[in-house]
Each structure stands twice: as structure tokens, then as C-alpha cells.
């Protein structure tokens, strides 16, 4: 019969013949021949392959590297590679989480708009005139300035963005 | 073992469009991206494009129109195309393993150098 | 356009020297920052991650500091071999994934 030119499903042209492919979870160790089955093994212990394939080397599960701000989200099989996460406090660079950045903390003056999750920054914004922030913080928004007046007291020194309202005690008119 | 190999022309001529591919071993594109960087000679280090293990995009933000980043994760393949070509644009061309993110493992480089 | 202002670009020292160079940033990066040594016809070497991390195998001679904008390398006591261009990285996001112009450290 002719040699095929082309192999079926799940497998492989090599040397005029067509061989199975090595199912995931295993790598390639020997090629079919015309009196022998394709041979295959396992792969080791941290090591995956997760196609149907003639790989030669199964990959190194992927290390979710701490200095990266990476933990374990899902533990890898033969057949998965290992899954990362940011750590608490840190989020994703990209959509694929490659590595992490710690939540950027919002400066005196800005208050948190949005608070930071593991895939987005915190988003802050201005305080806005009768607001201020006196920290730097991904958690606090702008705080509203104190009202003297609610407390008979009266204004001695203006807010700002940064700083609060200094409220003092109501001159008494002397008779 | 992790490796990464540039290919492409050596030489190509100004308004050319240069395709370059980097061809990986030792490890999954659909578990890593993998970034283009060049250097001109004598000068520093430019980012240019990247690939997620998710298949996004990413380009700097001077050079956006004229790149284009793509993957063939059978093939273990990253291409980058990097249209009308100029004489500045004469640099080593890298490919490194990652997206967003640092880049830990490089290829030795390939030379890419634009003349009429 | 973000930006990465690297300084000095090129430095003279001795063996033994503490050397310094620094990295800043157009805006807020976080720990999002990197450093290399690439030495003449070579790729980078990945030396600094998140801010102030040793990569892997990285002498310990090397450290990184800062957050935010501002960002240091610091070699404690120059070798031999650390007489190299050095680079930052920022990859915060994909709109700040640049390098920085690079500091060449040369032989006094």
C-alpha cells in the first residue's frame, strides 16, 4: 500500500507511518515502528503536558514566584499547569497575571475612588473642595470637612485638601 | 530546558516590512507570553510588543501602528511584523519570555540591520 | 507618555566601590520595577524584582529600594565583573512597560 501523506486524529506522520500521539500527562519516549506501538511515560512530579503530543520533555509546572507577589491559585496535575494569584494587597500587571504590583495607596490630598482588587489598581481621585485627605492610603476616601457650626463652634482656620477645618470657640460679646 | 531563539532577515531595505520569529522550547505559550525587545547599536533597551499566555496583545505605545504580534502555540512560535521599515530601525532584535512582566529568560539576538 | 529617567548615564568607580544609580518614574509605578546588567554582545540579566527582590543566583551584593516614582540600585562593594550597563524596568501595566536609557558603570 502507498505510504499516507497525511495521519488521523491524535496522530502523528514520521517515517512514511503513522504513530499515535502521546496522550496528555505523558511524554514522547520512542516512535511507533512498523511492529511496535508509539511508547510513552508519564510525566515526573512538577512537570505537565496538557496536549495530545510527541513531546520529548514534559514542561516545568510554572513557579508562582513571591517577589513577584504570586501564590498558588491552583495546584498543577500532569495534565494542568500550575495556576498563580496575586497575594493580598497586590493585583495583576495583565489580564494573563504574569506578575504582580502592590496596590498603589493614594496620596494626601486624594481619597480612594475605588478600592484595588487582585486584577485592578486603586483608583483614586481629588478631594473636592469640603473634603480632605490627611494620609496616604488605598483604603480612605476623602473625609468631609468638620461643620463648626453643628457643634456652636466657628471656623479659626480653613481646610484644604490635605488638612480639616480648625473649628474654634464663638467670640462672646462683652456687655 | 528553557530556550529562545530569534529568526529573521539580516538585511532589509527602508519601507520593507521586517517579520522576525522566535521559536520556543521548554515551556508552554499557552502557560507564558513572550516580548519583543530591541536595542540600536550603542544605545539602550526598547520594548516594542508583547503576547500573553492569553493570547492578549500588547504594543509600546510609539510604535503601535506599524507592529503586529501573533503566536502559534503548535508551532511554539512568536512573530512579530514591524511594517515600513527605516534605517533607525537598525537594532538587535530580542525576543524574551514573558508578557507583562520581567523577563528572566532572553535569546541571544539577531541583528536586523535596514539599507537600501 | 510614561517615561523612565535612568541616572547617571555612565559612571566611573573602583573595585570595591559602593555604587548607586537610580531609576524614576512619570508617575506612580508601585513595586512595579525591574533591573539588568547587560554586558557588550549579550542579553540583560534579570538582577532586581518587584522594587528591592533578588532575582535568582544574583549576588547579594546587589539591592534595590523604592516604591512609587523613585527607585535605586545599589552594588555595596564593585566587582570585577559588575563593570557592566545596568537598566530599569517598569512593568506596571502595558501603557508602562519601558526600559530606562541605562547607566554604563566603567573602570576608574
Known amino acids: 500500500p502507498e505510504p499516507p501523506t497525511a495521519c488521523r486524529e491524535k496522530q502523528y506522520l514520521i517515517n512514511s507511518q503513522c504513530c499515535s500521539l502521546c496522550q496528555p500527562g505523558q511524554k514522547l519516549v520512542s516512535d511507533c515502528t512498523e511492529f511496535t506501538e508509539t511508547e510513552c511515560l508519564p510525566c515526573g512530579e512538577s512537570e505537565f503536558l496538557d496536549t495530545w503530543n510527541r513531546e520529548t520533555h514534559c514542561h516545568q509546572h510554572k513557579y508562582c514566584d513571591p517577589n513577584l507577589g504570586l501564590r498558588v491559585q491552583q495546584k498543577g496535575t500532569s495534565e494542568t499547569d500550575t495556576i498563580c494569584t496575586c497575594e493580598e494587597g497586590w493585583h495583576c500587571t495583565s489580564e494573563a497575571c504574569e506578575s504582580c504590583v502592590l496596590h498603589r495607596s493614594c496620596s494626601p490630598g486624594f481619597g480612594v475612588k475605588q478600592i484595588a482588587t487582585g486584577v485592578s489598581d486603586t483608583i483614586c481621585e481629588p478631594c473636592p473642595v469640603g473634603f480632605f485627605s490627611n494620609v496616604s492610603s488605598a483604603f480612605e476616601k476623602c473625609h468631609p470637612w468638620t461643620s463648626c457650626e453643628t457643634k456652636d463652634l466657628v471656623v479659626q482656620q480653613a481646610g484644604t485638601n490635605k488638612t480639616d477645618v480648625v473649628c474654634g470657640p464663638q467670640d462672646r460679646l462683652r456687655a | 530546558e528553557v530556550t529562545l531563539k530569534e529568526s529573521g532577515p539580516v538585511l532589509v531595505k527602508p519601507t520593507e516590512t521586517l517579520t522576525l520569529t522566535c521559536t520556543v522550547s521548554?515551556?508552554?505559550?499557552?502557560?507564558?507570553?513572550v516580548s519583543w525587545i530591541r536595542q540600536p547599536p550603542g544605545k539602550a533597551l526598547e520594548w516594542l510588543a508583547g503576547?500573553?499566555?492569553?493570547?492578549?496583545?500588547y504594543y509600546a505605545s510609539w510604535a503601535k501602528s506599524r507592529l503586529t504580534i501573533s503566536r502559534d502555540t503548535n508551532l511554539k512560535q512568536v512573530v512579530l511584523t514591524m511594517t515600513n521599515m527605516d534605517p533607525v530601525d537598525t537594532a538587535t532584535y530580542y525576543c524574551?519570555?514573558?508578557?507583562?512582566?520581567?523577563?528572566?529568560?532572553w535569546g541571544q539576538g539577531t541583528l536586523v540591520t535596514v539599507s537600501s | 507618555a510614561f517615561q523612565l529617567t535612568q541616572s547617571p548615564s555612565s559612571l566611573s568607580a573602583s573595585v570595591g566601590d559602593r555604587v548607586t544609580i537610580t531609576c524614576q518614574a512619570s508617575?506612580?509605578?508601585?513595586?512595579?520595577l525591574a533591573w539588568y546588567q547587560q554586558k557588550p554582545g549579550k542579553p540583560p540579566k534579570l538582577l532586581i524584582v518587584?522594587?528591592?527582590n533578588l532575582a535568582s543566583g544574583v549576588p547579594s551584593r546587589f539591592s534595590g529600594s523604592g516604591s512609587g516614582t523613585d527607585f535605586t540600585l545599589t552594588i555595596s562593594s564593585l566587582q570585577p565583573e559588575d563593570f557592566a550597563t545596568y537598566y530599569c524596568?517598569?512593568?506596571?501595566?502595558?501603557?508602562?512597560?519601558?526600559f530606562g536609557g541605562g547607566t554604563k558603570v566603567e573602570i576608574k
Open positions: 524596568q517598569s512593568y506596571f501595566s502595558s501603557s508602562s512597560t519601558v
Open positions: 508617575q506612580s509605578i508601585s513595586t512595579g
Open positions: 518587584g522594587a528591592s
Open positions: 524574551a519570555r514573558g508578557g507583562i512582566t520581567v523577563y528572566a529568560m
Open positions: 503576547i500573553g499566555s492569553d493570547g492578549s496583545a
Open positions: 521548554g515551556f508552554s505559550l499557552s502557560s507564558y507570553g
